[in-house]
């Protein structure tokens, strides 16, 4: 015998209280596949989330982050404050990258400049807080282990939330 619920399309649920007929999902709920016995509650976009896609009877709402924040995790499960290029997020807020490190994005951490000498090259363009160094061909009389700034990796305590 075929399960009568298998005939219920996406956007409906198989209503046990009404002889297993297919009922439309109630407001603020959805079913993305057929044959469902319940509809799922739509995701709400509150706090620093904003609605990227409204919920429909067949698909969940999607959230992204309000300006000044970016998404973390699958499906934008959390938001994190943006910083400027040349900064990283610490527990005390956005801080400039230490000398010898850079960040070319509004998120993430400051990373050490490339050590050109490790590849037998010299520094063609100096690094900044926002940009990595550009390595060029080795200069005459180059001996490995010179012609490069190698700063210590910065100690970090990432993370800060707007209060």
């Amino acid at each position: 015998l075929q399960d009568p619920c298998s005939n219920c399309p996406a956007g409906t649920f198989c209503d046990n209280n009404r002889n297993q007929i297919c009922s439309p999902c109630p407001p603020n709920s959805f079913s993305s596949a057929g044959g469902q016995r319940t509809c799922d509650i739509c995701r709400q976009c509150k706090g620093v989330f904003r609605t990227r896609k409204e919920c429909s009877s067949t698909s969940n709402a999607e959230c992204d982050c309000t300006p000044g924040f970016h998404c973390l995790g699958a499906g934008c499960s959390m938001c994190e404050q943006d910083c400027k290029q040349g900064q990283e997020l610490t527990k005390k807020g956005c801080k400039d990258c230490c000398f010898g490190t850079f960040n070319d994005q509004k998120r993430g951490i400051c990373r050490p400049w490339t050590n050109c000498s490790l590849d037998g090259k010299s520094v063609l363009v100096n690094g900044t807080k926002e940009r990595d160094v550009v390595c060029g061909p080795a200069s005459a009389g180059f001996s490995p282990g010179t012609s490069s700034v190698t700063p210590p990796a910065p100690a970090r305590e990432p993370g800060h939330s707007p209060q």
Partner: antibody, heavy 119, light 107 residues
Amino acid sequence: QVQLVQSGAEVKKPGSSVKVSCKASGGTFNSYAISWVRQAPGQGLEWMGGIIPGFGTANYAQKFQGRVTITADESTSTAYMELSSLRSEDTAVYYCARKNEEDGGFDHWGQGTLVTVSS
Amino acid sequence: DIELTQPPSVSVAPGQTARISCSGDNLGDYYASWYQQKPGQAPVLVIYDDSNRPSGIPERFSGSNSGNTATLTISGTQAEDEADYYCQTWDGTLHFVFGGGTKLTVL
């Protein structure tokens, strides 16, 4: 089945530090936020801070800033909470808790670790 | 930080409806969760995102959140529901706040 298993009870002297661990099993570790919540005897729950292991992002409640450090080791699926400059008021049960992926609820909790601060 | 205020205690007769409130500035703009905690045990999530029930939580538990108040409602309260209940809010970032807790007594 997700499980959070915490390290054992600790007795500490005032002024010292304590580091409590929370090992996760049975689920993806790096994409879920792990929070630390404490409860002093007869008192309520207090959120201390949290971390998203896969992003290295940590954040702390204002009350604990500068005294708490939360870290995570993805290779062992373990989160850590270190509290320094301990005082008697820090005597409490410390819980780790995992945030559900897309919502704000802590759906899994560790068993709790009692930290006693006494001279 | 938003501050969450709960009544210290609520009493209810068995079979009746218990309502536990949680108030804070514009709380309805944020996500509210509720936890049940029995003596000597870790808290258990009973409501998340204002009104959603995790699997395994009885249907008698429901939640709402609008304006400045979130409410946990337990209809047909049973003796086993006697516990401490905590509200919690989340703004979407890695930041959470708990209310002070409410002791529910089933008379």
